[in-house]
């Protein structure tokens, strides 16, 4: 059931990995045998060196044999392999990074944990912040909006920078920046609410740099199933960081007796992590894991990158699907605790809440479930994809589609179960969220497959922008608006408070189904778009004249 195309067995999975390893061994042997003849001329400005006759390029999903190019004596020909910086030369191979790659991925994942820990520490003490600054609900909404909007606007900018400049420096600067801003925000006097708003906006910019660029470094450190695994670890940081953020926020506040101290924990850890990134993360070349090393010198304009991404159907559909996930998680995260509290009021197992926070216990349970299902979802998704890759080349989008469609069913069941059983509702939330989160790492992997290394950061950024714009930037407000609209035409009662919110939340499973459809659409174009990306990668390894991206 997990694989819809299991019959069409394509070259993939374990056999593909073994074949790749064998090809790499043979190529390393050939490279060691090639001596420098001293005939290597200077490369043309901006030109990528060309390979030896019959050389193979390790791409995202296998190898492509290239036609012999270049006359003897030109950079990259067999006689110059040792000294030329062409593909024929000895490249810094993924294997040569050894344990360093694992450490780099671990540090990047830790950074992602801190990214979300910081974000949700603020969420964990938001009531205290609101109380301290005298923030109204519209003010709290403004804080959220400013964060998301600045994140959205900054993401494409960092995408552009990430495809053109030193990524680990940008990453570290981003971490140092949001750490400094968060730390400073813990000292903002009560009368300067606008400074708090500004600080959230600046933190959004800092965090956008990380969310946009870090996955592309992982993409350049690993390939195939290893990359899926590493991206899974990286994206598991989201629920882990979120959960830890809530815990950090409330526990530090209680221990120190002042919520201000909660905002001083993640910045300290952030500074340490930023330093570790500078030290331990290798300055990988774009396409490094794809055995392209120094070949990817070709630069395209931002406008050209955008055009190429918009024409990339797999990328567009997977981005729309990601927006659907974002829509659902944003809306459910905001409203489910209150919805379950209202369900308990209707069932007469809880009192009507007149003084917020309402459903604090439900928020805690929901947070714990989200944290665990995030982990379970990422593991399940990665595992299912690994297995399905043995059967079909379309495994990635199909696993996502099945996860989404399955999730929609269980999200629908939440509203059925909540009327009579809160435990039943929590079970549906658990299964629904696990399935919904199963596509986190896979979506990132899809992007790595269908987008060439030199525009991956831009792609991640644009996807991030789209998913926030069409997703969680508006979904919590839209649900609230629909709920209020329904309530206006009904009598004021606890039952209708519960029902109106439930009917409004029913929009989520429909959007999730739509997301599933977008993943199915991705599956239609995935193989051809992946092949096109590999072909473009090979073209990037040609002399400048032949580069057509």
């Amino acid at each position: 059931m997990m694989c819809l195309e299991c019959a069409s067995a394509a070259a993939g999975g374990a056999e593909e990995e073994e074949a790749d390893a064998e090809r790499r061994r043979r190529r390393r042997g050939a490279q060691r045998g090639a001596g420098g003849s001293g005939c290597c001329g200077a490369r043309g400005a901006g030109g990528a060196g060309v390979s030896a006759a019959g050389d193979e390029v390790q791409t995202l999903s296998g190898s492509v044999r290239r036609a012999p190019t270049g006359p003897p004596g030109t950079p990259g020909t067999p006689g110059c392999a040792a000294t030329a910086k062409g593909p024929g030369a000895q490249q810094p191979k993924p294997a040569s990074l050894g344990r360093g790659r694992g450490a780099a991925a671990a540090i990047l994942s830790l950074g992602n944990v801190l990214n979300y820990l910081d974000r949700y520490t603020v969420a964990g003490v938001l009531l205290d912040i609101a109380q301290h600054f005298g923030v109204k609900d519209r003010g709290a909404g403004l804080l959220q909006s400013v964060f998301i909007c600045s994140f959205m606007v900054a993401a494409p900018i960092f995408g552009y920078l990430g495809d053109r400049f030193n990524r680990k420096v940008i990453l570290s600067c981003g971490i140092f920046f949001w750490s400094a801003v968060t730390f400073s925000s813990s000292f903002i006097p009560q009368q300067y609410f606008w400074l708090l708003v500004l600080s959230r906006g600046l933190v959004g910019i800092g965090e956008a740099s990380y969310s946009t660029i870090a996955p592309t470094i992982i993409g350049d450190l690993f390939t195939k199933n290893t990359r899926t695994l590493m991206l899974s670890v990286f994206y598991f940081a989201i629920p882990l960081g979120s959960g830890l953020g809530y815990i950090t926020g409330s526990s530090v506040k209680q221990a120190a007796g002042d919520w201000h101290w909660a905002l001083r924990v993640s910045p300290v850890l952030g500074m340490i992590t930023g330093t570790l990134i500078l030290i331990l993360v290798p300055a990988t070349k774009r396409g490094h894991a794809d055995q392209l090393g120094d070949q990817l010198k070709a630069r395209t304009s931002w406008l050209r990158d955008m055009k190429a991404l918009i024409r990339n159907r797999s990328y567009v559909f997977s981005s729309l699907a990601t927006s659907a996930v974002s829509f659902a998680t944003g809306a459910l995260g905001m409203w489910i605790p209150l919805y379950l509290h209202r369900a308990q009021v209707v069932q007469k197992t809880a009192e009507t809440c007149n003084s917020p926070p309402c459903g604090a216990k439900d928020s805690l349970i929901f947070g714990a479930i989200t944290c665990f299902t995030g982990f379970l979802g990422v593991v399940t998704g990665a595992g299912a994809t690994r297995w399905c890759r043995l059967k079909t080349q379309r495994a990635d989008p199909l696993v996502c589609a099945v996860g989404m469609l399955g999730s929609a069913i269980f999200i629908c069941l939440i509203f059925v179960a909540a009327k009579s059983s809160i435990v039943g509702a929590y079970i549906c939330i658990f299964v629904g969220e696990t399935l919904l989160f199963s596509n986190w790492a896979i979506t990132a992997d899809i992007l790595m497959y269908v987008v060439i290394p030199t525009r991956r950061a831009t792609a991640v950024a644009l996807q991030s922008f789209t998913s926030h714009l069409l997703g969680d930037a508006g979904s919590p407000y839209l649900i609230g608006f629909i709920s209020d609209l329904i309530r206006q035409s009904t009598k004021d009662s606890p039952l209708w408070e519960f029902l109106s919110l439930g009917y409004a939340l029913m929009l989520c499973p429909f959007v999730v189904v739509l997301g599933g459809m977008f993943f199915l659409a991705t599956a239609l174009f995935f193989v051809s778009d992946r092949a096109r990306a590999e072909q473009q990668v090979n073209q990037l390894a040609m002399p400048p004249a032949s580069v057509k991206v």
Partner: antibody, heavy 125, light 107 residues
Framework: EVQLVETGGGLVRPGSSLKLSCATS????????MSWVRQAPGKGLEWVAL??????????NYAESIKGRFTISRDDSKSRVYLQMNTLRDQDTATYYC????????????????WGQGVMVTVSS | DIVLTQSPPTLSVTPGESVSLSCRAS??????IHWYQQRSNESPRLLIK???QSIAGIPSRFSGSGSGTDFILSINRVESEDFSVYYC?????????FGPGTKLEVK
Amino acid sequence: EVQLVETGGGLVRPGSSLKLSCATSGFTFSDTWMSWVRQAPGKGLEWVALIKDKNSNSEANYAESIKGRFTISRDDSKSRVYLQMNTLRDQDTATYYCTRHEDFYYYSGYYFDYWGQGVMVTVSS
Amino acid sequence: DIVLTQSPPTLSVTPGESVSLSCRASQGISTSIHWYQQRSNESPRLLIKYASQSIAGIPSRFSGSGSGTDFILSINRVESEDFSVYYCQQTYSLPLTFGPGTKLEVK
């Protein structure tokens, strides 16, 4: 011009109830946080209760000394704020001031920028 | 709860003199302190907000300073209408609390 006018004070016996009312004008009441502050004869000021605007779910906060006995409420359609005082004690004898918090649309100050003239509540047997 | 201590309880001055009234908080409260003046048989009125910010309609001879735990209300050349009780109030955390007041009287 901002105006706050308190009514409903008087002499009551311990254990009885009383409801104070504060009529307001000259500002957008529905957006504004309101408080009651009291002052016992010859003593200092003591904050009693705060009610936030509808945008903050009309959340109420109380001083520990009156929690569970007093209830603050508001009626935006009438631009009025109320203080329902139950189980009154001798030590509740004071002048009760209706106060307004300065409003900044997205947030509100916790200080009091306008005060009513006050209403006397005497609890005595 | 945050406790505010005002000193001195009573201050006797002659008109034209300049005075400083002190307010001390039991814990650090940044600049979340406000000053009120209450004349005899009148309602209090806001003089200074957030330790040092002036209020429209309040004479410029009133000024405030301080941060953390120690705050000062200064009156430059006291006038006859200034003889009244002055209260400080903290808004750093709920419950909102007032100081016991400082009575400014004619010497």
